[in-house]
């Protein structure tokens, strides 16, 4: 087989972190820098337990919407910008996605983008206002009440903040230590300078697969993978390892 | 209309060098890898190399690798061919093709002749 | 790399026939998508070739519904149904699942 000169060109998804008030659209844009002539580009959700969960696709020059249709992908005008949306996005969105790069034969590759962070805030809605004039200004002395009150309360915040943190902290160290990091807390990368594939790479699924039901995380997650890619991402060095049709079982969800 | 023009070639002597060009038209070059294929006297049809859209990887055959190097001006929609170290197997049509496998348009192919 | 092998020569056949052109690869071109990487091409005398089929059985745009592809994922068929005259030339197979991308030898069709 032929080995091509390749450098490293990553996959890129935009912007690292993303907040939208909920019912709005998120919209991500991943770029690929070279487009093969064949290709599949998905669009993925991290799950707790770091497992890849795949919203919707685009493949041969038309969208492969999920089983939630409000995930899409659509390719524009470029050719090598592609918008991810979620359309009308709720809180439980909140979470980080990714997006992956399968280059089909000849020249058979596997790419996969940083990670992104959506948060969708909770819509406050804003009691309506009796009149339409504007407050009356507020005179030295009322102004210096105003300072002082809002003083207090926000030293109130603080304490109630001191007293949760404190809380949250000793009562973990009486019950046991437990390794496990908050939920919502973006997965961190580990001191290894090269990404690490976290997709499950025990099979190509093609077509869309039934997700079984996650079980809760436990506080130590398995350390097993069916197989870690890990590309070298200096600029100037080889690409990802070619993958050879006869290499059994397909390594990535496509 | 898609359309390859393909130009350069030439009678060359074994050894030499020549560099043929292709010019498109019809189609947004840059988002389309590109290819050159031979065919020799005995019209076997042979894949010569690729470059992909944005130029990030190239192939090449076995008999032209390390002579041969595809390039393409994106800015003037043009796909090139520097052939080096020519030898008489390399006497053949060239085509350029559009796509890095799928070929689904061919230029109408520059004759180069490699003789002593 | 992936040999291609093609008969040389069909059976000269008569305008309105049905022939069947035959290609084989010495390994699969059945993809993990599903897909088969093969081609086929046509080339008229004094042209350059053109795609008929690709992916083995997917009609390139603009090509006629006689023309059909069909096979295994090592052993290929080119079906032309109601031959006509425009139809004489050179067929090549070709496979895309690796590089270097080869093709087939040809098979050359020819009018009785």
């Known amino acids: 087989l032929d080995s091509p000169y390749r450098p490293w060109s990553p996959l890129t998804f935009s912007p690292a972190q993303l907040t939208v008030l909920e019912g709005e659209n998120a919209t991500f844009v991943c770029h690929l820098p070279d487009v093969p002539e064949s290709f599949v580009l998905n669009w993925y959700r991290v799950s707790p337990r770091n497992q890849t969960d795949k919203l919707a696709a685009f493949q041969e020059n038309h969208t492969e919407p999920g089983k939630d249709r409000r995930f899409r992908v659509t390719r524009l005008p470029s050719g090598q910008d592609f918008h991810t949306t979620i359309l009308a996005a709720q809180l439980n969105d909140s979470g980080i996605y990714l997006c992956g790069a399968i280059y089909l034969p000849p020249n058979t590759q596997i790419y996969e983008s940083p990670r992104a962070e959506l948060t969708v805030k909770e819509r406050v809605l804003e009691p309506p206002t009796e009149s339409p004039s504007p407050p009356p200004r507020l005179t030295g002395q009322g102004q210096g009440l105003v300072v002082g009150v809002t003083s207090v309360l926000v030293g109130v915040l603080l304490l109630l903040l001191l007293t949760w943190v404190l809380a949250a902290a000793f009562p973990r160290a009486t019950r046991g230590a437990c390794a496990c990091g908050s939920e919502d807390e973006p997965l961190k990368e580990g001191p290894s300078a090269a990404p690490v594939f976290t997709v499950d790479y025990g099979e190509l699924d093609f077509q869309w697969r039934e997700k079984t039901p996650e079980p809760p995380a436990p506080c130590a997650p398995e350390q097993t993978e069916y197989a870690t890619i890990v590309f070298p991402s200096r600029p100037g060095s080889p690409g990802p390892l070619p993958l050879r049709p006869e290499d059994g079982p397909c390594p990535w969800p496509l | 209309e898609v359309q390859l023009v393909e130009s350069g070639g030439d009678l060359v002597k074994p050894g030499g060098s020549l560099k043929l060009s292709c010019a498109a038209s019809?189609?947004?070059?840059?988002?389309?890898?590109m290819s050159w294929v031979r065919q020799n006297p005995d019209k076997r049809l042979e894949w010569v190399a690729t470059?992909?859209?944005?130029?990030?990887?190239?192939y090449y055959s076995d008999s032209v690798k390390g002579r041969f190097t595809i390039s393409r001006d994106n800015a003037k929609n043009t796909l090139y061919l520097q052939m080096n170290s020519l030898k008489s197997e390399d006497t053949a049509m060239y085509y350029c093709?559009?796509?890095?496998?799928?070929?689904?348009?061919w230029g109408q192919g520059t004759l180069v002749t490699v003789s002593a | 790399g992936v040999v291609i092998t093609q008969d040389e020569l069909s059976n000269p056949v008569t305008s309105g026939e049905s022939v069947s052109i035959s290609c084989r690869s010495s390994?699969?071109?059945?993809?993990?998508?599903?897909?088969?990487?093969l081609n086929w091409f046509l080339q008229r005398p004094g042209q350059s070739p053109q795609l008929l089929i690709y992916?083995?059985?997917t009609r390139a745009s603009g090509v006629s519904d006689r023309f059909s592809g069909s096979g295994s994922g090592t052993d290929f068929t080119l079906e032309i149904s109601r031959v006509k005259a425009e139809d004489v030339g050179v067929y090549y197979c070709?496979?895309?699942?690796?590089?270097?991308?080869?093709f087939g030898a040809g098979t050359k069709l020819e009018l009785k």
């Open positions: 093709t559009r796509g890095e496998s799928r070929f689904a348009y």
């Open positions: 019809g189609f947004t070059f840059n988002n389309f890898g």
């Open positions: 470059l992909s859209s944005g130029s990030s990887y190239t």
């Open positions: 390994k699969s071109l059945l993809y993990k998508d599903g897909k088969t990487y």
């Open positions: 992916l083995m059985s």
């Open positions: 070709q496979q895309l699942i690796e590089y270097p991308l080869t």
